[in-house]
């Protein structure tokens, strides 16, 4: 479990009402690991972020990342549930001013500082693959996923619905 | 189909305690977190509190250590015990669910209608 005040010092408002609404309706921090239990990690490097997928020693402390959630103002295109209830969208962000974002060009995630509002390359629309999983899908590019290739986070492209339960785009949320 | 039906609200004196449930039903695949907002007459929606399904909580400052979140997930259902309570705390309370159902993997937001707490003397 977490107290208030970490989360409360990341509380941001988006201003683009069309993409998903003036504010996240929840936040929460969190830590991000791998379907195999490795974690993401970020380190500050040549005054740049990157982005870590390692396994911890056993003691040492998980980066927490904050995830704010967000309605999207449209309906879903899906069939099935139809209105009933609102698609959510996430932003993640490890450290005050820095969020995840797609470059689809380099097939990249990567970590921004950015102004607000935030670009639609910082949102990811939230799936339920697998029990405890979560996925995260580019909002610029749906069927195109945040995963894991040779150690570090890239965007890979899921070309059916069999293969949603792919363990490298697969990912655990943890408050421990 | 999600629903999510509260109880529990109702008229308090300053002081006093109150005790929401709220409990999903529907085809639910899984639930990402369950929490409480509310909408005090003029005023925009705002947290509560919510609970992961992992177990970590989040409240506002303005609850912290009158209110507690805790969850059921055996029933899909939540709690906000409520203690110490003010006449600021006059609000509907509407309960708030993340969940991927089994027609969809996309996690989407469900609310229920609303329960009213009014404290006052």
């Known amino acids: 479990a977490f107290g208030i005040s970490g989360v409360q010092k990341y509380t941001r408002a988006l201003h683009d009402s069309s993409i998903t609404g003036i504010s996240p309706i929840t936040e929460y921090l969190a830590s991000l690991s791998t379907y195999n239990d490795q974690s993401i990690t970020f380190a500050l490097e040549d005054e740049s972020y990157e982005i870590y997928v390692e396994d911890l020693k056993k003691d040492e402390k998980k980066d927490k990342v904050l995830l704010s959630y967000y309605e999207s103002q449209h309906p879903s295109n899906e069939s099935g549930d139809g209105v009933d209830g609102k698609m959510l969208m996430v932003t993640l962000s490890p450290t005050k001013d820095f969020w995840l974002h797609a470059n689809n060009k380099e097939h990249s995630v990567e970590l921004h500082k950015c102004e607000k509002p935030l670009p639609d390359q910082a949102f990811f629309v939230l799936h339920n693959m697998h029990s405890n999983c979560v996925s995260f899908e580019c909002k610029t590019d749906p069927g195109v996923f945040i995963g894991v290739k040779d150690n570090h986070l890239a965007l890979i492209k899921v070309d059916s619905s069999e293969n949603l339960c792919t363990e490298n785009i697969l990912f655990k949320l943890s408050e421990t | 189909q999600v629903q999510l039906v509260e109880s529990g609200g109702g008229l308090v004196q300053p002081g006093g305690s109150l005790r929401l449930s709220c409990a999903a039903s529907g085809s639910i695949r899984t639930v990402n977190y369950m929490g409480w907002h509310r909408q005090a007459p003029g005023k925009q929606r705002e947290l509560v509190a919510v609970?992961?399904?992992?177990?970590?909580?989040n409240y506002a400052d303005s609850v912290k250590g009158r209110f507690t979140i805790s969850r059921d997930d055996s029933k899909n259902t939540v709690y906000l015990q409520m203690n110490s309570l003010r006449a600021e705390d006059t609000a509907v309370y509407y309960c708030?669910?993340?969940?991927?159902?089994?027609?969809?993997?996309?996690?989407?937001?469900?609310w229920g209608q609303g329960t009213l707490v009014t404290v006052s003397s």
């Open positions: 708030n669910a993340a969940a991927s159902t089994y027609s969809s993997t996309v996690v989407r937001s469900f």
């Open positions: 609970v992961t399904s992992g177990g970590g909580t």
